[in-house]
Interface confidence: low
């Protein structure tokens, strides 16, 4: 018996071939011997089956001795053995219809779980193998779960259903709702304007929700809310903002925040959360601010950084075009009685300069000038 696999909602064509290459009488019946369709001369006749309005054939093929049964908009309950009667012969075809759906919305937040459920006819024992867009192979039975979705799981999931050495392939588009970056770090000299950007890793027609930026300053004992905002059809409106610092926010996506000036008391870590309408859970992006200050007080030239720096970062003080006078894995370095000239304070990671601040040391009879 021939086995054909079909997909729920699709169209299937079951073949039936006569040895004579001409139009002769044929009938398609189901396992209960109820006539589905057949012919009377060159006319298509239909029986009383449930498939009535969804069953068809191709008259153009009858003259070649081919009498297909076409079933449109397949349903799981169409799974059955179909019998073609032609030339005193009976050809049996077993049709198995499967459906695969994401049993939740196909737009899921990063970290959430995706469950794919297979609808299958009674008596079948299919196996399912799905491949995520990042090439991850997942196998399962009637249900298949993937926990902790990552950004790389966005895209088309290709699932193969195997039954009786036959296979049928499903494609499901999954959108993982997340920020493009889980974390970012901004390095600024004291007094500079700070730009924070929070680009989303997905695009949807309408985006509505609300968000908030909580900030934990390095010098503060507790975190505080710097800004809250609403998002309506990709338009941003600020609800509440602290007076210190007074952040400004862009009115359109991507989410964009401006801190008028970088000050040591603002250095620290922030967490931007975005709650989307009709979604449980929130999107998160961490943002870090490192602030540098170079000062000269009396005979002491000091360079300091505030904020979440890695222990491997190097802080150096050097006179322009000369070797570093002092270089330490510390958050503050200083030089006593510095020579006159342009001094550079450098924060670097494996030789790559992340932040630089220059300070001019004048002869001892002058006062310092900070560019």
């Amino acid at each position: 018996k021939k086995v054909v696999l079909g997909k729920k909602g699709d169209t299937v064509e079951l073949t039936c071939t006569a040895s004579q290459k001409k139009s002769i009488q044929f009938h398609w019946k189901n396992s209960n011997q109820i006539k589905i369709l057949g012919n009377q001369g060159s006319f298509l006749t239909k029986g009383p089956s449930k498939l009535n309005d969804r069953a068809d054939s191709r008259r153009s093929l009858w003259d070649q001795g081919n009498f297909p049964l076409i079933i449109k908009n397949l349903k799981i309950e169409d799974s059955d053995t179909y019998i073609c009667e032609v030339e005193d012969q009976k050809e049996e075809v077993q049709l198995l219809v499967f459906g695969l759906t994401a049993n939740s919305d196909t737009h899921l937040l990063q970290g959430q779980s995706l469950t794919l459920t297979l609808e299958s006819p009674p008596g079948s024992s299919p196996s399912v193998q799905c491949r995520s867009p990042r090439g991850k192979n997942i196998q399962g039975g009637k249900t298949l779960s993937v926990s902790q979705l990552e950004l790389q799981d966005s895209g088309t999931w290709t699932c193969t259903v195997l039954q009786n050495q036959k296979k049928v392939e499903f494609k499901i588009d999954i959108v993982v709702l997340a920020f493009q970056k889980a974390s970012s770090i901004v390095y600024k000299k004291e007094g500079e304007q700070v730009e924070f950007s929070f680009p989303l890793a997905f695009t949807v027609e309408k985006l509505t929700g609300s968000g908030e930026l909580w900030w934990q300053a390095e010098r503060a004992s507790s975190s505080k809310s710097w800004i809250t905002f609403d998002l309506k059809n990709k338009e941003v409106s600020v609800k509440r903002v602290t007076q210190d610092p007074k952040l400004q926010m862009g009115k359109k996506l991507p989410l964009h925040l401006t801190l008028p000036q970088a000050l040591p008391q603002y250095a620290g870590s922030g967490n931007l959360t975005l709650a989307l309408e009709a979604k449980t859970g929130k999107l998160h992006q961490e943002v870090n601010l490192v602030v540098m200050r170079a000062t000269q007080l009396q005979k002491n030239l000091t360079c300091e950084v505030w904020g979440p720096t890695s222990p491997k970062l190097m802080l150096s003080l050097k006179l322009e075009n000369k070797e570093a006078k002092v270089s330490k894995r510390e958050k503050a370095v200083w030089v006593l009685n510095p020579e006159a000239g342009m001094w550079q304070c450098l924060l670097s990671d494996s030789g790559q300069v992340l932040l630089e601040s220059n300070i001019k040391v004048l002869p001892t009879w002058s006062t310092p000038v900070q560019p």
Partner: antibody, heavy 118, light 108 residues
Framework: EVQVVESGGGLVQPGGSLRLSCAAS????????MHWVRQATGKGLEWVST???????YYPGSVKGRFTISRENAKNSLYLQMNSLRAGDTAVYYC????????????WGQGTTVTVSS | EIVLTQSPGTLSLSPGERATLSCRAS???????LAWYQQKPGQSPRLLIH???SRATGIPDRVSGSGSGTDFTLTISRLEPEDFAVYYC?????????FGPGTKVDIK
């Protein structure tokens, strides 16, 4: 430095049990598939088990029902519980990390030796 | 089970020569799921190629992979002394994720 280090190998009698451990460091352990692969002296590589990030587990027929792979993400640790051991299980057992964006074992340990003998 | 067959079993070549190693699968394997490894005596295996043709980090461009379906090839354009080793292919198309028996490349 990204690395995996196996431990727990040793001499065990046929029918006995052994638990291998693999300590991972230098990467976000929970985000990667992890594998056990073995190699008998002078022979080729044989895949033993895989655990996915979702906790999904895979085994070849030769060890199915006898070996159990598990992971403890909080401890950055991978385990292989081996029961009903046979002489044919004697080998060097390697722990390996699966690629993040692709299929392939991109980080391997030095291996731990398991000897099943009476 | 997908069975991988590697040929030849041993390849005897001189430094500077081109090495062509074959890996044949008993049934079709998506190229995304084929990897190649190198193993030297007393050492752990090392990933060379993933996705049939993508070089792993740090692998020189004299090493390349190709193929699709059931036939895959690993090519080393000019053999260097450090390339003499055993090479294995592995498939992830379906569980069990089998390895080939290996091809030994030794000095002529």
């Amino acid at each position: 430095e990204v690395q995996v280090v196996e431990s727990g190998g040793g001499l065990v009698q046929p029918g006995g049990s052994l638990r291998l451990s693999c300590a991972a460091s230098g990467f976000t352990f929970s985000s990667y598939d992890m594998h056990w692969v073995r190699q008998a002296t002078g022979k080729g590589l044989e895949w033993v088990s895989t655990i996915g990030t979702a906790g999904d587990t895979y085994y070849p027929g030769s060890v199915k029902g006898r070996f159990t792979i598990s992971r403890e993400n909080a401890k950055n640790s991978l385990y292989l519980q081996m029961n009903s051991l046979r002489a044919g299980d004697t080998a060097v057992y390697y722990c390996a990390r699966g690629g993040y964006y692709y299929y392939g074992m991109d980080v391997w340990g030095q291996g731990t030796t398991v000897t099943v003998s009476s | 089970e997908i069975v991988l067959t590697q040929s030849p079993g041993t390849l005897s070549l001189s430094p500077g020569e081109r090495a062509t190693l074959s890996c044949r699968a008993s049934q079709s394997v998506s190229s995304s799921y084929l990897a190649w490894y190198q193993q030297k005596p007393g050492q752990s295996p090392r990933l060379l190629i993933h996705g049939a043709s993508s070089r792993a980090t740090g692998i020189p461009d004299r090493v390349s992979g190709s193929g699709s379906g059931t036939d895959f090839t690993l090519t080393i354009s000019r053999l260097e002394p450090e390339d003499f080793a055993v090479y294995y292919c592995q498939q992830y198309g379906s569980s069990p994720f089998t390895f080939g028996p290996g091809t030994k490349v030794d000095i002529k």
